[in-house]
């Protein structure tokens, strides 16, 4: 079998809401993946599991099941959304994200994603990690790749 390539493209959008009483930030982060099937037969993308970390704390998890089938030598772009919560244990972040004296409230999040594919009963897992900038101060849509954090901090491919 040839490889199945998973490429994390970046954050597509981040929608933010707040609970001032509990100093909580809710961020719905939509990410984009490109999955390429280099085989001469179809493969099934069985599930995608994702988690988001802020400052070594997991702030959100998501799992998508029975996603799609990718045909021979084909590529599909898949969007997945991770709902995240930065709760009052990090209430200083609420103050930062709602500070009106600054325009952009970028925070660095680590995006982790694992894609499970199956073909002929065989299962394969491919994982990616990426640091991304996300603006926690407003709803934002990004050009793909625009939210990339400094490349030097990215894990090796």
């Amino acid at each position: 079998p040839r490889s199945i390539d998973v490429k994390y493209i970046g954050v597509k959008s981040a929608y933010v809401s707040y609970d001032v009483q509990k100093r909580t930030i809710y961020l719905n982060i939509t990410n984009t993946l490109n999955i390429t099937n280099n085989n001469y037969y179809s493969v099934e993308v069985e599930n995608i599991t994702a988690q988001v970390q802020f400052s070594k704390t997991v702030i959100g998890k998501a799992r998508l099941n029975n996603i799609t089938i990718i045909g021979p030598l084909d590529m599909k772009q898949i969007d997945y959304t991770v709902p995240t919560v930065i709760a009052e244990e990090m209430s200083y972040m609420y103050d930062f994200c709602t500070l009106i004296s600054i325009k952009v409230h970028n925070i660095v999040l680590m995006m982790q994603v694992t894609v499970t594919t199956t073909y002929f009963g065989h299962s394969e897992q491919i994982s990616q990690e990426r640091y991304q900038y996300v603006d926690c101060g407003r709803n934002t849509t990004y050009q793909l790749g625009q939210s990339e954090y400094l490349n030097v901090l990215q894990p090796q491919q």
Epitope: V20, Q21, K22, R23, T24, V85, A87, E88
Partner: antibody, heavy 117, light 112 residues
Framework: QVQLQQSGPELVKPGASVKLSCKAS????????VNWVRQRPGQGLEWIGW????????IYNEKFKGRATLTVDTSSSTAYMELHSLTSEDSAVFFC??????????WGQGTSVTVSS | DVLMTQSPLSLPVSLGDQVSISCRSS???????????LEWYLQKPGQSPKLLIY???NRFSGVPDRFSGSGSGTDFTLKISRVEAEDLGVYYC?????????FGGGTKLEIK
């Protein structure tokens, strides 16, 4: 230790308004929220409302909406609650409480309000 | 509104006793952010309430370790392992998860 000093007892006529104050011993109200709580004689505690001093955002118990007005003067670290259209049902002790996201950690000593003609 | 029901209403004790106070909410009080904002306050006669426990089981600073909180979902308990004279008063549970925030009716801890 944070101390919240509330204004003295009030005797007011039915239909009138009263404005109670709650002064912090430090500049606590620039960093913390304030809740107000009512306790009728021999009764339990009832949450009135909450204020976020940084921008004056308020949230009220529906029961008190339109009758209670919460404000904060951060320069003097004083919180205020004004209660309008008082009836005998409003005769109670009113407490202010400094509030973290997790809980009401320090309370004032309470202000007694008596509504009587 | 979330109704907070405490039991018993009155709890006669002897000094040194271990006691439990129950608090039941009419619906789950897990906040949208995942935390459970269940607090316990003690009000001594003629005084303002004092915070004992926050977020179900966290003791507030200066609160003796004979006080402990537990529970989840809709059922919560405050335990006092050895009652002392200074513990007498009315105990209130409180939920700060769903608006309007609500108190329980109170449990009066008194000497037998």
């Amino acid at each position: 230790q944070v101390q919240l000093q509330q204004s003295g007892p009030e005797l007011v006529k039915p239909g009138a308004s009263v404005k109670l104050s709650c002064k912090a011993s430090d500049n606590t109200f620039t960093n913390y929220d304030v809740n107000w709580v009512r306790q009728r004689p021999g009764q339990g505690l009832e949450w009135i409302g909450w204020i976020y001093p940084r921008d004056g955002t308020t949230i009220y118990n529906e029961k008190f909406k339109g009758r209670a007005t919460l404000t904060v003067d951060t320069s003097s670290s004083t919180a205020y609650m004004e209660l309008h259209s008082l009836t005998s049902e409003d005769s109670a002790v009113f407490f202010c409480a400094r509030t973290l996201p997790q809980a009401m950690d320090y309370w004032g000593q309470g202000t007694s309000v008596t509504v009587s003609s | 509104d979330v109704l907070m029901t405490q039991s018993p209403l009155s709890l006669p004790v002897s000094l040194g006793d271990q006691v439990s106070i129950s608090c039941r909410s009419s619906q789950t009080i897990v906040h949208r952010n995942g935390n459970t904002y269940l607090e316990w306050y003690l009000q001594k006669p003629g005084q303002s309430p004092k915070l004992l426990i926050y977020k179900v089981s966290n003791r507030f600073s200066g609160v003796p370790d004979r006080f402990s909180g537990s529970g989840s979902g809709t059922d919560f308990t405050l335990k006092i392992s050895r009652v002392e004279a200074e513990d007498l008063g009315v105990y209130y549970c409180f939920q700060g998860s769903h608006l309007p925030w609500t108190f329980g009716g109170g449990t009066k801890l008194e000497i037998k």
